[in-house]
């Protein structure tokens, strides 16, 4: 199930500046992102910005700058004109629409005890998806087997045995870091980062994101829309998400150049994947 995370932070240099970061984790392509404050989109919230992956962005005061950070995450800078900093107690919501599959929305606010500039993402939680856990388990078994073989070889040193040549797999490493999204109902979490190194391409996961980001879900509000939408129980615990970084893809903070309809925007481990162009009314 696709999920959304939200993080709100106050800028260290300007106490009146806030930044909202939102991200989408899951399969499917994003057709529109809506950022609102004061509540969810369509439930009393006021829209601050709308971002389209191809056509650009639209924003309304007090939004200062809305931009794509990666293929599946955005940031919105806000300028607080008032001295009382109303943003500090405001809920910000991000809605990722994938037409016609569905839309997913999650909300967050500035942590109550956050010092300026120190509102980094909450402490990560080491939670793995079931398929990754299975792979790690298998890796453990293989490692144990290798260790056992080495043990046997050491025991039989007196016998002339051919030296085993280790095979080196030159495949990319997948690093997954689990973070907790900023949500109003979220309690503080105090666990170290969970780092996973495997030797397979993330696109080979059964629910890999078309952009190459593996879908490692987080808890968020899911509003299924359209016949293709189906809700399933997230495997991860409530309030956690995992971002997958991969060297094949565009560097964080960059956005791939607009290539137009029908061209490959994002690389895929299995080879080029055509991204459907915009379907405008002309």
């Amino acid at each position: 199930t696709p999920e959304v995370w939200v993080q709100v932070q106050m800028e260290a240099t300007e106490l009146s500046s806030f930044t909202v970061h939102c991200g989408f984790l899951g399969p499917g392509s994003i057709s529109l992102v809506t950022v609102s404050w004061g509540g969810p989109d369509g439930a009393g919230g006021t829209k601050l910005a709308v971002l389209h992956p191809e056509l650009g962005t639209r924003q309304w005061a007090p939004a200062r700058q809305a931009r794509w950070e990666t293929q599946s995450s955005i940031s919105l800078a806000l300028e607080d004109s008032g001295a009382s900093s109303p943003f500090a107690n405001t809920t910000f919501c991000c809605k990722f629409a994938s037409f016609p599959e569905g839309s997913w929305e999650s909300c967050g606010s500035l942590p109550p005890s956050s010092d300026p500039g120190l509102s980094a993402p909450p402490t990560p939680v080491p939670i793995l998806r079931a398929d990754l856990a299975g792979i790690l388990g298998l890796s453990g078994v293989l490692l144990f087997g290798c260790g056992y073989l080495l043990h046997l070889l050491r025991r039989q040193k007196h016998r002339p045995t051919p030296r085993l040549q280790p095979s080196h797999t030159n495949s990319q490493a997948l690093t997954a870091q689990a973070w907790a999204p900023s949500q109003a109902s979220q309690a503080a979490l105090h666990d170290p980062y969970a780092t996973i190194n495997t030797s397979f391409c993330p696109a080979t996961l059964d629910t890999a994101h078309p952009n190459g980001w593996a879908s490692l879900p987080t808890h968020a509000a899911h509003q299924p829309q359209g016949p293709a939408a189906s809700a399933s129980t997230p495997i991860l615990a409530r309030g956690s998400f995992v971002s997958v970084e991969n060297g094949l893809y565009t560097q964080a903070g960059e956005r791939p150049p607009h290539t137009g309809p029908g061209l490959t925007l994002f690389p895929d481990c299995r080879g080029p994947r055509a991204v459907e162009g915009r379907f405008g009314v002309r």
Epitope: S31, G45, T46, L55, A97, G280, V281
Partner: nanobody
Framework: EVQLVESGGGLVQPGGSLRLSCAAS????????MGWFRQAPGKGLEGVAH???????RYVDSVKGRFTISRDNAKNSLYLQMNSLRAEDTAVYYC???????????????WGQGTMVTVSS
Amino acid sequence: EVQLVESGGGLVQPGGSLRLSCAASGFTSRTDCMGWFRQAPGKGLEGVAHIDSDGIPRYVDSVKGRFTISRDNAKNSLYLQMNSLRAEDTAVYYCVVGFKFDEDYCAPNDWGQGTMVTVSS
């Protein structure tokens, strides 16, 4: 919460007519277009028609002169009158509410479950 419910789909013979309706509720500020998209079996999505906040209708070339989009603000409803239907008009039709990034495109932010239109003899 924004809710869009389409109705009026069904089976019709080539050359026939159908009128699709969309009942909308839960609107918020800063939504500036309403329209219809369709998805034919095994094909991609296509914007059929939309109305801007200023009431100007826009159509995809393939339906110009055959389809008419209209809205009733008092009833919070959107309509699509489809005449001279062809087999290639067979699709699931979605009512959408969205945002304009240029004149020709209403980017969907909310949509309904869709209603099936089948044109066949």
